[in-house]
Interface confidence: low
């Protein structure tokens, strides 16, 4: 309606004596600025002076006259939005209508607004949620209609009486639209919340007590157990009994189930608060609980651990690790279902106990082959001794020991002999697959572990075999002593060191590089004459007649080697020379005559000499002297001399007689 | 030839610790338990405990688990052993011993470690 | 841990003589182990497995026994023999020493 003025507020405020009353308020005039304003209490119309008529608690005249009630009551507005007011401190007697009587310069209007005030703080009002669920969280909200700036107040929360430790939220509100002071509690009820008392509290700036609000929680939640067992302790023997009882502390809504667990699994035909358990086996160990469901789901009552005790079952052994190799470490883990656990262990090796040996677990740092074996243990608790099981089987993996190359052959082996030899080995895990002989040759192997040699050499000295499974183990080397004869027979000359020369003194050795046995005679010869039985053939003073083809010869038990045929030379000077004459020593003149210089030399003549009568020496140098045609005058003694690098000779005198020609007597 | 070379003597302060070496040549340094020993002067042998090259794995006598610290480093084949916490008690000579391969029993011995520990 | 005993502490023997020493052990024992040691040097392993000689050791050495009694024995002392003897068990960890007996020639 355009003929109103426009006011806004809340339509009643609330507040109790002693506090103070803000009347947030917000107007709009139909026309020009507020001229006048008065605020009475409980107005009531005139209609005989067209006046309203009631207390004035406040009063804005242009001429500026306030009355007393003033310093009370407080106009906060302007002439043309706001009229908020304050009342402080607000009385019972408050209580009413306010009236706002507002003038502008042509208009008037009365705004109502009704004020509460009562003669206590009136208690805040606390909500909560339509169900309350254990775990869940909720929001605890406590409502107070009631806010003034000049009064401060606070809710605190209580839970039966004990202020509660979760944060509070407070908010307040005042606006045209409200007035309130709200706190918010966020809360994860559990089970044992329910039926209990919150409170809300309302108290002044300084804590003290104003008023409050109550609520008992009604908390859903599934039954709450307790479980109770017969012994207590829950420790039995086989063959005992034992009574469980299944309590429900609390549910709501009402339970409607019961059924009993043992290990997460239910147990059939169980469905009443007591379980009972005749005669009880080992089998029945385990974890035992109730369980009983409302509408809000199953609850379960905390594990019961039934321990039912027995002797030592028969004991099984756990090595690691099987098979294992000689030098490693090894475990062994004695393994016996009991109750209580098994405090003494007994082992044994191959049957026979391991002293000392008292633990669940054998450690032994280095295993040899003599660890190898079956292994079993027995365990024993306060019950009784368990039954010794199968045991485990201990293999221990080793080279081949004690491997030893073997000669079969009979001694001595002779060069050229056939030999078998073995490969023999005292023990082997795993058995011995393949052998390995050293060093390698083209043999052949006719079965395992033996090596035949053919023809077996001088010089096969030693052979080594190895027997191998998943290592290798070597046998010191074999010697074969292998018999043999004399071996690179040779004829060696000892002096002089350079040539021989006639007359100079001679040694030859007999040389070879080895034999075996190393017992040997040597034999000296000649053009198939022996000439002596030492290692040295020496010769004192040389001749050229002791030129010529010389062997030696070694022998031991085997056989006999002979050397190569060596040449001893000679070397002298040219010697038994002689001047022959050919045809003849007589020769007819005209005809030819050749002198031949002949000599016995080592190395041979290399330069020859003629000479005549005269001891003249002649122009010729070679071997023959030519004479053609021969003269009569030619006739007389001639000698020749020959020379080589030993030194020279010289021929006796040869006579060449010439005679006359038939023709040349003739002319005579 | 198997040898077992000790570290040389030595002199600590009580609280102090002390590091023994021994060095092993002639065999193969992964194959075979080395065991350190003790021996007070005029006394008998006390065993400290073993290390095993080859896998790691050591082994102590509870009455020195929190005296001595086995250790080893295999690119010298050598074996430490260090004592902590000194005091007069822990004077002694100290020996390492190898097990001898195919039979128990400590068939190699180094030639002992003099520790004498004095303020 | 398993306490060995030996006895006696200390003895003498006339050269020729017999000479028996002997090592107990708390709790029973597969076998022992006996060492030599002389002053101022390293133990020596003497006898392993109760009854085998270690190498080099003089067959008038001999060793025996089983469960908790063990010996050693000299057929005929020799003058080199002076020297401790330390009984050893390997049955067991911790492995354990007994206090030795001291051999002198009388």
């Known amino acids: 309606d355009s003929s109103k003025w426009v006011f806004e507020h809340p339509e009643t405020l609330y507040a109790w004596e002693g506090a103070c009353v803000w009347i947030p308020c917000t107007y709009r005039a139909l026309d020009g600025d507020l001229e006048s304003f008065i605020l009475f209490h409980n107005p009531e119309y005139n209609k005989n002076t067209s006046k309203f008529d009631g207390t004035r608690l406040y009063e804005s005249t242009k001429d500026g006259k306030v009355p007393s009630e003033q310093k009370r009551v407080q106009f906060l507005g302007d002439k043309n939005k706001n009229c908020t007011l304050s009342i402080h401190p607000v009385h019972l007697n408050d209580s009413g209508q306010l009236g706002l009587r507002m003038e502008s310069k042509t208009e008037k209007w009365m705004e109502r607004i009704h004020l509460n005030v009562s003669e206590r703080p009136f208690p805040p009002h606390i909500q909560l949620p339509p169900e309350i669920q254990e775990s869940q969280e909720v929001t605890l909200t406590c409502l107070l209609n009631f806010s003034c700036y000049g009064y401060p107040i606070q809710l605190q929360w209580l839970l039966e009486g004990v202020p509660m430790r979760q944060a509070a939220v407070t908010s307040t509100s005042l606006t045209i639209k409200s007035v309130f002071t709200r706190s918010e509690l966020k809360f994860s009820p559990q089970w044992s919340h329910h039926g209990k008392i919150v409170t809300c509290q309302l108290q002044d700036a300084d804590g003290k007590f104003l008023s409050n609000d109550t609520v008992q929680l009604n908390v859903k939640h599934t039954p709450k157990l307790e479980i109770k067992v017969t012994p207590s302790d829950a420790i039995v023997r086989e063959g005992d009994s034992v009574t469980m009882t299944c309590e429900v502390s609390s549910s709501n809504p009402e339970y409607t189930t019961v059924s009993w667990l043992k290990d997460g699994t239910s147990l059939k035909k169980q469905n009443t608060f007591t379980l009972n358990l005749r005669e009880v086996t080992k089998d029945q160990s385990g974890k035992y609980c109730c369980q009983v469901s409302n509408d809000v789901g199953p609850g379960r009552s905390e594990e019961v651990f039934l321990q039912v005790q027995y002797a030592p079952e028969p004991s099984t052994v756990q090595i690691l690790h099987s098979p294992a190799v000689e030098g490693s470490q090894v475990e062994f883990l004695c393994m016996s279902l009991a109750n209580p656990l098994p405090t003494n262990y007994t082992w044994y090796h191959n049957g026979k106990e391991m002293q000392g040996r008292t633990e669940e677990k054998v450690h032994i740092p280095k295993i040899l082959p003599w660890h190898a074996g079956t292994y079993s243990c027995v365990a024993e608790n306060i019950l009784g001794t368990g039954q010794r099981g199968p045991g485990a089987e201990l293999d221990v993996q080793y080279p081949p020991k004690k491997v030893t190359t073997v000669i079969q052959n009979p001694m001595p082996i002779r060069e050229g002999d056939t030999v078998t030899l073995s490969c023999n080995y005292n023990s082997s895990n795993p058995s011995v697959t393949r052998y390995e002989w050293k060093p390698h040759g083209a043999w052949e192997e006719p079965s395992l572990g033996v090596l035949k040699i053919q023809n077996v050499g001088w010089d096969n000295t030693t052979i080594a075999c190895a027997a191998c499974n998943s290592w290798c183990s070597w046998a010191s080397p074999v010697a074969l002593n292998v018999q043999y004869a004399p071996r690179d027979v040779r004829v060696r000359k000892i002096k002089p060191l350079s040539e021989i020369h006639s007359g100079n003194s001679v040694s030859l050795q007999c040389d070879f590089s080895s034999s075996h046995p190393k017992e040997v005679q040597f034999f000296w010869e000649k053009n198939g004459r022996l000439l002596g039985k030492e290692s040295q053939l020496n010769f004192d003073s040389i001749s050229p007649e002791d030129a010529g083809s010389y062997s030696c010869w070694v022998n031991n038990s085997i056989g006999q080697t002979a050397s190569k045929a060596w040449t001893l030379e000679v070397l002298y000077a040219p010697r038994r020379l002689r001047v022959s004459m050919s045809p003849g020593d007589q020769v007819m003149e005209g005809k030819s005559a050749t002198l031949t210089c002949e000599s016995d030399a080592n190395p041979p003549v290399s330069h020859y000499t003629w000479f005549d009568w005269n001891n003249q020496s002649l122009p010729y140098h070679s071997q023959k002297l030519r004479l053609e045609p021969v003269k009569v005058q030619h006739s007389g003694a001639y000698w020749c001399q020959g020379t080589n690098s030993v030194g020279k000779g010289r021929s006796p005198l040869s006579t060449l007689t010439v005679y006359y020609s038939p023709e040349t007597i003739g002319r005579r | 030839k198997v040898q077992l070379q000790q570290s040389g003597a030595g002199l600590v302060k009580p609280g102090a610790s002390v590091k023994l070496s021994c060095k092993a040549s002639?065999?193969?340094?992964?194959?075979?338990?080395l065991h350190w020993l003790m021996q007070r002067s005029g006394q008998g042998l006390e065993w400290i405990g073993w290390?095993?090259?080859?896998?790691?794995?050591?082994k102590y006598n509870e009455k020195f688990k929190d005296k001595a610290t086995l250790t080893a480093d295999k690119s010298s084949s050598t074996v430490y052993m260090e004592l902590s916490r000194l005091t007069s008690e822990d004077s002694a000579f100290y020996f390492c011993?190898?097990?001898?391969?195919?039979?128990?029993?400590?068939?190699?011995w180094g030639q002992g470690t003099l520790v004498t520990v004095s303020a | 841990e398993n306490v060995l005993t030996q006895s006696p502490a200390i003895m003498s023997a006339s050269l020729g003589e017999k000479v028996t020493m002997s090592c107990r052990a708390s709790?029973?024992?597969?076998?022992i182990f006996w060492y030599q040691q002389k002053s101022d040097a390293s133990p020596k392993l003497w006898i392993y497995?109760?009854?085998n000689l270690a190498p080099g050791v003089p067959a008038r050495f001999s060793g025996s026994g089983s469960g908790n009694s063990y010996s050693l024995t000299i057929s005929s002392m020799e003058g080199e023999d002076a020297a401790t003897y330390y009984c050893?068990?390997?049955?067991?960890?911790?492995?354990?020493f007994g206090s030795g007996t001291k051999l002198e020639i009388k």
């Open positions: 011993a190898r097990h001898e391969d195919g039979y128990d029993g400590f068939a190699y």
């Open positions: 002639g065999y193969t340094f992964t194959d075979s338990i």
């Open positions: 290390f095993y090259p080859g896998s790691g794995s050591i």
């Open positions: 709790s029973s024992v597969n076998y």
């Open positions: 497995y109760t009854s």
């Open positions: 050893q068990q390997f049955t067991s960890s911790p492995f354990t």
